[in-house]
Amino acid sequence: TPLGPKWPEPVFGRLASPGFPGEYANDQERRWTLTAPPGYRLRLYFTHFDLELSHLCEYDFVKLSSGAKVLATLCGQESTDTERAPGKDTFYSLGSSLDITFRSDYSNEKPFTGFEAFYAAEDIDECQVAPGEAPTCDHHCHNHLGGFYCSCRAGYVLHRNKRTCSALCSGQVFTQRSGELSSPEYPRPYPKLSSCTYSISLEEGFSVILDFVESFDVETHPETLCPYDFLKIQTDREEHGPFCGKTLPHRIETKSNTVTITFVTDESGDHTGWKIHYTSTAQPCPYPMAPPNGHVSPVQAKYILKDSFSIFCETGYELLQGHLPLKSFTAVCQKDGSWDRPMPACSIVDCGPPDDLPSGRVEYITGPGVTTYKAVIQYSCEETFYTMKVNDGKYVCEADGFWTSSKGEKSLPVCEPVCGLSARTTGGRIYGGQKAKPGDFPWQVLILGGTTAAGALLYDNWVLTAAHAVYEQKHDASALDIRMGTLKRLSPHYTQAWSEAVFIHEGYTHDAGFDNDIALIKLNNKVVINSNITPICLPRKEAESFMRTDDIGTASGWGLTQRGFLARNLMYVDIPIVDHQKCTAAYEKPPYPRGSVTANMLCAGLESGGKDSCRGDSGGALVFLDSETERWFVGGIVSWGSMNCGEAGQYGVYTKVINYIPWIENIISDF
């Protein structure tokens, strides 16, 4: 019996009946054994077939078998109902070997030419299986020459049997207070040969509750308890299960914060598995009762471990823990069933006693001493000498705890001194230097500091003066001795003020003319305004109409009198404004340099002389009455003049204040 070629020889070739293409002899038996490499099979087909036909091919035949299985017994030339001829069929070995047997009996009724066949080894596609057969691989099958291999989807690992995919289903830890877990692939059949471990691990104080939901289908056995696949539930207290079959297990209240669920499957079966919905519970905390004027959020039927609530107060009420304020309040339920902090109070907002108003007073409108939410107070300024700036003085205690004006301001109103009040009434005609009476020039300030000079009070903490009068003290403001509220230069009865800072106009050049001869002194404290100490007003935009040529202004001071001495008593003089060109011309003659009188100056005095300000009056105010407001305002500052005061044809020269309003306002607002 000839053996066919064996691997590793090339596996292909030709087979033929003895004597082919001639007729075959009687009583022949030939056997060929073909062997292919592992993972390959043999393919055989006939190019010629002519054998004696007999019932069930009992006489002459070709038999193809693979292992113990007969693939075909062939005879004749064409197939009949009971006999088979190969025709164009191709035959395949079941494994890697194929046996071919040719046999002829003792006689042939006519000559038959036998057969010719060709064979070859070809790769087996192990991944293709017949319908109804078990697949080669659990998940993915990969064919290659001479073999195949299996692989698994993500989340699975290939079992050591190289075909089954076991689920990677261990190590999952559930830490939420509720959730769902299920067998792998649920509700599709769960994987074989798997061992799954799931952990539920909640904070101490919680108790896990397990509910089996939807369906339960785990391979079972009629007599033995869960021998194949099973589900077990373990806590630190006890074990539940094993569970299998088709009945949903009952709810399990574990009384534990940690649960381990184990699910083990074997190599067979087709079951959908299980699904668990878990929740948790804990010892509830006392139901939170909102404090008066507050509410709890969120509102729940009960509050357990880790649940929280916040307290919100009604408008006009604030969270307080005793005396300590809180912007927000949240309490958390603890594992022992107590809240982590006590309930605060929602106390009515109390704005507290209102601040005192300098030079003013406060009145409780709602009720004596009532300072709580929506209470109203009324600030007012001391009459006659002070007036309230901008504000109507009405303040309400608002929800934020601050007294707030109708314009929404939280700062105090300002009592601004009333300016330009004087006890003096003007007669309108020019007369000689006069002694001032109390209250005539309440803005008059005496400045001592090396020389005697004057100034005028602005507001309650500024003095307007001439730059030349305080130039030497510009870096030593504290050296200035500032006195007010007195008529007598040498009187011990006066109000003392001290300088905090001296501001000289940046355009003033000392010893080089008197342009920009203006300065401001900031006092280190506010002075109290009364009939003897009152600020002068600054000129309004319309003030020029009261300062035309021949309009009367009044200068006051303790400067040199006709007798050549500083006045003991405050003196004043009413003098007319002089035409600017006329004044300029008066000072263009020697010894005065050209351009001595600038647009920043105004002149006042008599052409005939005799009425003038003089040395010692420097820095004092030349004031005018605003007939519309009936207030006095400063139009000029005593600056310079002829060497001989009151000289005929010469005039007193004054700094023109209206030109410096922006400068004054900027300094006062900045400092």
Epitope: L324, P342, F402
Partner: antibody, heavy 118, light 106 residues
């Protein structure tokens, strides 16, 4: 982590004003709570001076109210103590502290020693 | 002003003992009382708030109790690191501290 740090002069002359600064890191002073000044007098006696709340409202020890001012600079997350007309009895270690009455932790600065002496 | 009285300036104890520090308010302060521990050269450290609530991180051997006017800080199983001065604070109406109780070894 919330931290508070006091700063200011260690020596102040009688009748002058004492000014201290507390710089807060790790928490905004406008977010919540009361921001306090507390002093520890010789002999270890602790005395509450006053606070400024998250909203800017102040509360002062009645015995010091006429001399005290607590203000803040929210841009720098600082709050300040000014105590006027000091005497030797104001000599103490001054602490700034966040006090919450249990609604959040209490935090104290390390303290700064102030001596009132001529 | 509410006065908080800590009648015992000093208390002697041994490691492992149980000790109670008392504080009495001159008027009702509800439960708005805190307890502080202060060691030399350090700032006070908060132990208890709201009379009985322990701050996180504070060992459970420290317990606060009381309401109204009488308050107690109990230290069970005293440790050497507990030797310090203890102050009570009321924050019901303004804020006032007790004068302090110093815990020392017998």
């Amino acid at each position: 982590d919330v931290q508070l740090q006091e700063s200011g002069p260690g020596l102040v002359k009688p009748s002058q004003s004492l000014s201290l600064t507390c710089t807060v890191t790790g928490y905004s002073i406008t977010s919540d709570y009361a921001w306090n000044w507390i002093r520890q007098l010789p002999g270890n006696k602790l005395e509450w001076v006053g606070y400024i709340s998250y909203s800017g409202r102040t509360s002062y020890n009645p015995s010091l109210k006429s001399r005290i001012s607590i203000t803040r600079d929210t841009t720098k997350n600082q709050f300040f103590l000014q105590l006027n007309s000091v005497t030797t009895e104001d000599t103490a270690t001054y602490y700034c502290a966040k006090l919450a009455g249990g609604h959040g932790m209490d935090y104290w600065g390390q303290g700064t020693s102030v001596t009132v002496s001529s | 002003n509410i006065v908080m009285t800590q009648s015992q300036k000093f208390m002697s104890t041994s490691v492992g003992d149980r000790v109670s520090v008392t504080c009495k308010a001159s008027q009702n302060v509800d439960t708005n009382v805190a307890w502080y521990q202060q060691k030399p050269g350090q700032s006070p450290k908060a132990l208890i708030h709201s009379a009985s609530y322990r701050y996180s991180g504070v060992p459970d051997r420290f317990t606060g109790s009381g309401s109204g006017t009488d308050f107690i800080l109990t230290i069970s199983n005293v440790q050497s690191e507990d030797l310090a001065e203890y102050f009570c604070l009321q924050y019901n109406s303004y804020l006032t501290f007790g004068s302090g109780t110093k815990l020392e070894l017998k």
